[in-house]
Amino acid sequence: SGTTNTVAAYNLTWKSTNFKTILEWEPKPINQVYTVQISTKSGDWKSKCFYTADTECDLTDEIVKDVKQTYLARVFSYPAGHVESTGSTEEPPYENSPEFTPYLETNLGQPTIQSFEQVGTKVNVTVQDEWTLVRRNDTFLSLRDVFGKDLIYTLYYWKSSSSGKKTAKTNTNEFLIDVDKGENYCFSVQAVIPSRRTANRKSTDSPVECMGHEKGESRETGHHHHHH
């Protein structure tokens, strides 16, 4: 199976959020197809996305086997219509990806405020725990399950009537903050892994939720609301 006129892939890039992990590359194929291989440092290469005309490959199923391992992927280029031939010794053109360690490098997805509940001058704000595709004993793990205390949330809150923001931090998914009685507050949260020293240390901010809207109400009004 000759590999003449096939070009090696380039710009191999990992795109990963909450461990959902896709390898992307160029170029868009003209008369060629791609196969991806992925390995940890063991060198046990596993083939994925066989003879695809796409320029991306979902490698989530492989990296979630051990998110603390470091992975390398490589993309092989074959002529379109390629049929695997056992007799061929010619190595197709390929390129290696950068190394990727999911635990250190996956981006933190935008969090969501699940609920808030006011009791007097205290408000309990709960952050929704996102599910990931990481498994343990055939059970999917949440982001908190995977990161444990390495993951914190920062809460930004402010009176609806002013712009001065306050912050609180938690290494659980709950905040208990003091508020002024009779004031409505708005809330936004951000996921943070403080031990990271890179750009992917923080998530984007959650959508803003404000008291007096349906996500949560003061208990004093007689109804408090939880969205799941």
Partner: antibody, heavy 118, light 106 residues
Framework: EVQLLESGGGLVQPGGSLRLSCAAS????????MGWVRQAPGKGLEWVST????????YYADSVKGRFTISRDNSKNTLYLQMNSLRAEDTAVYYC???????????WGKGTTVTVSS | DIQMTQSPSTLSASVGDRVTITCRAS??????LAWYQQKPGKAPKLLIY???SLESGVPSRFSGSGSGTEFTLTISSLQPDDFATYYC????????FGGGTKVEIK
């Protein structure tokens, strides 16, 4: 501390066989590909063979293909090189090395000397 | 097979000198290149991988650069401990080493 210790070298006649071993410690052995590199007296480095962490993938230099067999026993943290049909040109110091992805060698043993001579 | 050619084969230098060793590949190997240092009677030691990534514990006076077919190892200020033989190694397709460059005292 990561350590690799080769053994099994010695003097052997042309056509003879020898089995080299490499005992690994200080890291999770099965997590890494491993390799053998040799160096003939006064010469440069020559890659010989690589094996993946599971032992499922093996690679050989053309100069040893069909004569040498690389293997590993992950339960014993040991790498092996079975060398058959030895030739004078196989005379060298044989180094065992830890080889992430099977690509480069980040830890080396001290080496064991193989001499093929009649 | 990809051939790796190192130059010079021998280099005479003094302590404090800036030293540059070149390695050329017979075809493009992207950045898949490592550099090793070897002293007489000792095992090689990894200095640089992926053309420019410094291995942990290696002094910062060592640096690597290049991609494609031409690569360099630079020692910014040669120290007494640096007199040794240096090898490049490609890992784009299987593994091949360069012939080595011996750095000796002038």
């Amino acid at each position: 501390e990561v350590q690799l210790l080769e053994s099994g070298g010695g003097l052997v006649q042309p056509g003879g066989s020898l089995r080299l071993s490499c005992a690994a410690s200080g890291f999770t052995f099965s997590d890494y590909a491993m390799g053998w590199v040799r160096q003939a007296p006064g010469k440069g480095l020559e890659w010989v063979s690589t094996i993946s962490g599971s032992g499922g993938l093996t690679y050989y230099a053309d100069s040893v293909k069909g004569r040498f067999t690389i293997s590993r026993d992950n339960s014993k943290n040991t790498l092996y090189l079975q060398m058959n049909s030895l030739r004078a040109e196989d005379t060298a110091v044989y180094y065992c090395a830890k080889a992430p992805y099977g690509y480069y060698m980040d830890v080396w043993g001290k080496g064991t000397t193989v001499t093929v001579s009649s | 097979d990809i051939q790796m050619t190192q130059s010079p084969s021998t280099l005479s230098a003094s302590v404090g000198d800036r030293v540059t060793i070149t390695c050329r590949a017979s075809q493009s190997i992207s950045s898949w290149l490592a550099w090793y240092q070897q002293k007489p009677g000792k095992a090689p030691k990894l200095l640089i991988y992926k053309a420019s990534s410094l291995e942990s514990g290696v002094p910062s006076r060592f640096s690597g650069s290049g991609s494609g077919t031409e690569f360099t190892l630079t020692i910014s200020s040669l120290q007494p401990d640096d007199f040794a033989t240096y090898y490049c190694q490609q890992y784009k397709s299987y593994i091949t080493f360069g012939g080595g460059t011996k750095v000796e005292i002038k």
